[in-house]
């Protein structure tokens, strides 16, 4: 029962994590204008992986997509790639794990097959989570570097009367969503891998026992059950109980509207 719960929980945690990775990838607030010197601004800039936006005091927001591919920084392209790989791996992992769930019966699928599928999806979730964490961390590092560079530039060349204030960017909400989501996917993957160990039928090594019958000397050695490594296993060992754990997979998150002056 604990194995089923672990597997189910791992699935749900990974599902939430992957939903978060998708949300973070689509979000526009990867970097937001630093408001340290001016906490309330008439023009507020923020940027995502796919477009940059400007919100005015008037309440209007204008977003413009990055319509160039070659003109974008290599780091941004790398972050995009990492996030997409994370989403793809996570989606495949979810698909595999659905069929691997112990509480779902599909034909005469063996526990050994389910164990392998659980392990596969677990590994996929771990890699997916790592991709998301790596992507977000690369972007964060890029922001930190640019922040200090623009801070240094702010205090140079101000001898004249006219000031040119350079817009500095800091961490946006998407980074935190990405980190948390990546972490959840990673945790979910680890849970799936743990569940896999419990799902795999144990190799029972019975010692050879000699039965001495009168007149004959017969040695009887029962064969041990061995878990198959392939998906299409033909071994017929079945668990006696059927796990009945149910998963709460209809978790909806509603975006909140933030209005700024």
């Amino acid at each position: 029962m604990a194995v089923t719960a672990c597997q189910g929980l791992g699935f749900v945690v990974s599902l939430i994590g992957i939903a978060g990775i998708i949300a973070a990838t689509c979000m526009d607030q990867w970097s937001t204008q630093d408001l340290y010197n001016n906490p309330v601004t008439a023009v507020f800039n923020y940027q995502g992986l796919w477009r940059s936006c400007v919100r005015e005091s008037s309440g209007f927001t204008e977003c413009r997509g990055y319509f160039t591919l070659l003109g974008l920084p290599a780091m941004l392209q790398a972050v995009r790639a990492l996030m997409i790989v994370g989403i793809v791996l996570g989606a495949i992992g979810l698909l595999v794990s659905i069929f691997a769930l112990k509480c779902i019966r599909i034909g005469s699928m063996e526990d050994s097959a389910k164990a392998n599928m659980t392990l596969t999806s677990g590994i996929m979730f771990i890699v997916s989570g790592l991709c998301a964490i790596a992507g977000v961390s690369v972007f964060a590092n890029m922001l930190v570097t640019n922040f200090w560079m623009s801070t240094a530039n702010m205090y140079t060349g101000m001898g004249g009367m006219v000031q040119t204030v350079q817009t500095r960017y800091t961490f946006g909400a998407a980074l935190f969503v990405g980190w948390v989501a990546g972490g959840l996917t990673l945790i979910g993957g680890v849970m799936m891998c743990i569940a896999c160990r419990g799902l795999a039928p144990e190799e029972t090594n019975y010692k050879a026992v000699s039965y001495h019958a009168s007149g004959h000397s017969v040695a009887y050695k029962p064969g041990g059950f061995k878990a198959s490594t392939g998906f299409g296993s033909n071994t017929k060992n079945k668990k006696i109980y059927d796990g009945g754990a149910r998963t709460e997979d209809e978790v909806q998150s509603y975006p909140s509207k933030h209005d700024y002056v």
Epitope: Q33, A42, V43, C53, S58, V162
Partner: antibody
Framework: EVQLQQSGAEVKKPGASVKVSCKAS????????MNWVKQAPGQGLEWIGL????????SYAQKFQGRVTMTRDTSISTAYMELSRLRSDDTAVYYC???????????WGQGTSVTVSS | DIVMTQSPDSLAVSLGERATINCKSS????????????LTWYQQKPGQPPKLLIY???TRESGVPDRFSGSGSGTDFTLTISSLQAEDVAVYYC?????????FGAGTKLELK
């Protein structure tokens, strides 16, 4: 047709308060930020502050901070500006103005004359 | 605060002639996010509220005659009336719409010569 109708002229004594209203019509009141601008006799324009009618968020010019309060009543599409501890240099015409693209004020009220005199 | 400096204080131009009003800001009004200059021009006639002419430094408000045009970027801006008409006699103000507090220039009084 977009219209901003302001309340009538006021005569106040120093130290008193005045509350000017601005009734909006012809557009979605909560969809546009409302600004207040002061114009002293024979002088230029001076920004007092703004209010976001959607959430009531405000931003005031430092000069008026602590003396000005901007509110709104979305049920009657009206914005208010209250100026307290009035002084003689508060004698001016006060305008409400709707903010549009580029933070530009595209529609203005007719103005409310406030005279502070003892 | 961003200081807006208008020049000249007053300007006398003949009918049909070109009128040019300058506005200089103490800080750049160019927003890097959308590459737009947050500068607005208003016209005010005696006893009337101001009227919006140009926003984003060069975008003409709908209904404004095309003889009015705005130009400039960063800190230096210009309002040009290509052929002055009698109804253009007014006071013209530039305004910083980029940073709080939103500040206006002192105004330029345009008169007929």
């Amino acid at each position: 047709e977009v219209q901003l109708q302001q309340s009538g002229a006021e005569v106040k004594k120093p130290g008193a308060s005045v509350k000017v209203s601005c009734k909006a019509s012809g557009y979605s009141f909560t969809g546009y930020t409302m600004n207040w601008v002061k114009q002293a006799p024979g002088q230029g324009l001076e920004w007092i502050g703004l209010i976001n009618p959607y959430n009531g968020g405000t931003s005031y010019a430092q000069k008026f901070q602590g003396r000005v309060t901007m509110t709104r009543d979305t049920s009657i599409s009206t914005a208010y500006m209250e100026l307290s501890r009035l002084r003689s240099d508060d004698t001016a015409v006060y305008y409400c103005a709707r903010m549009n693209y580029g933070n530009a004020m595209d529609y203005w009220g007719q103005g409310t004359s406030v005279t502070v005199s003892s | 605060d961003i200081v807006m400096t208008q020049s000249p204080d007053s300007l006398a131009v003949s009918l049909g002639e070109r009128a040019t009003i300058n506005c200089k800001s103490s800080q750049s009004l160019l927003n890097s996010g959308n590459q737009k200059n947050y500068l607005t021009w208003y016209q005010q006639k005696p006893g009337q509220p101001p009227k919006l002419l140009i926003y984003w430094a060069s975008t003409r408000e709908s209904g404004v005659p095309d003889r009015f045009s705005g130009s400039g970027s960063g800190t230096d801006f210009t309002l040009t009336i290509s052929s002055l008409q009698a109804e253009d006699v007014a006071v013209y103000y530039c305004q910083n719409d980029y940073s709080y507090p939103l500040t206006f220039g002192a105004g330029t009084k345009l008169e007929l010569k």
